[in-house]
């Protein structure tokens, strides 16, 4: 009897959908695996007789529930199938946006870039998929614990009237208000402001 794959799960970030599993202990030799997806009531092979413990399902439709399954194989024997259901648009993790930060005197000028999507044109980003897409920005004075959050209305934001010669850190994430779903924070970007722009009279 061949044991089934263990810990079968979908790892999906920005619609890069990777079905992952672990190989069970099996004394007779090395197992191979076959992973399939349900298409029009028929299961279709995606990865056949692979020695890997993952299979890329990024070409699935972003919409709807998909049934995926994987089994272990050895010689002419095979395990039972292990099934999972996956809805990309609901289940994919929203990866961190890109961010460009520029210091201008006592202001930080930020531009945000929505995450790109696997298997899509360069210009078709997560913002195109989710109509309610917005950004959350948090910033803080480097070395302090107090964080401030803002929700920019556009793909850019300016933090004005900051303390001069002070290092501020900024990070951004995608947020979907209609789903109350937040993405992953970007790595903090820390920049030092320069002088106060006001001219003494």
């Amino acid at each position: 009897m061949v044991p089934p794959p263990e810990n079968v799960r979908m790892n999906s970030v920005n619609f890069k959908n990777i079905l992952q599993w672990e190989s069970p202990a099996f004394a007779k030799g090395n197992l191979t695996f076959t992973a399939q997806y349900l298409s029009y009531r028929i299961f279709q092979d995606k990865c056949m007789n692979t020695t890997l413990t993952e299979c890329d399902f990024s070409s699935l439709s972003k919409y709807g529930d998909h049934t995926l399954r994987v089994r272990a194989e050895f010689a002419d024997e095979h395990s039972d199938w292990v099934n999972i259901t996956f809805c990309p648009v609901d289940d994919t993790i929203i990866g961190p946006p890109g961010m460009q930060v520029e210091v201008l005197a006592d202001s930080l000028h930020m531009r945000f870039l929505a995450p790109k999507i696997e298997n899509e044109y360069e210009t078709w980003t997560m913002k195109n998929v989710y109509n309610s897409w917005t950004y959350n920005v948090q910033y803080w004075k480097n070395g302090t614990d107090e964080k401030f959050q803002i929700t920019p209305q556009y793909d850019f934001e300016v933090l004005r009237n900051l303390e001069p010669w002070t290092t501020y850190c900024v990070q951004v994430r995608g947020f979907l208000p209609d789903r109350n779903k937040a993405g992953e924070w970007s790595e903090p970007v820390c920049e030092q402001t320069t002088h106060d722009e006001t001219v003494p009279s």
């Epitope: 070409s59 972003k62 919409y63 648009v89 298997n119 044109y121 078709w124 998929v129």
Partner: nanobody, 124 residues
Amino acid sequence: EVQLVESGGGLVQPGGSLRLSCAASGNSLDYPTIGWFRQAPGKGLEGVSCISASDASTHYADAVKGRFTISRDNSKNTLYLQMNSLRAEDTAVYYCAASLHGLGCKSEADYDYWGQGTQVTVSS
């Protein structure tokens, strides 16, 4: 059942132009995303371009960027693909497709309705 009908294909010399059209028989082309795909001889289906209804944004495959232009005329319920500076490698059957959910642009899995295709041959 929605039927998409492409037209405008033909034989053209390298460097020439063609304009493909796609109409929905008896229906409007009022879909969140509509796009063009192509299939070259012996190759798989390849995304060419799409247009999003929500913001009228247009998106292109790298291979056609700057040469092809997608547009839609809502009054005529027609989708167009203007193809300029055509090359031999653009030879393919071109398909129009429409998506009900509009979540994707390039992947054929994200489209629900398809036309029968129109042949484009670029040759001297």
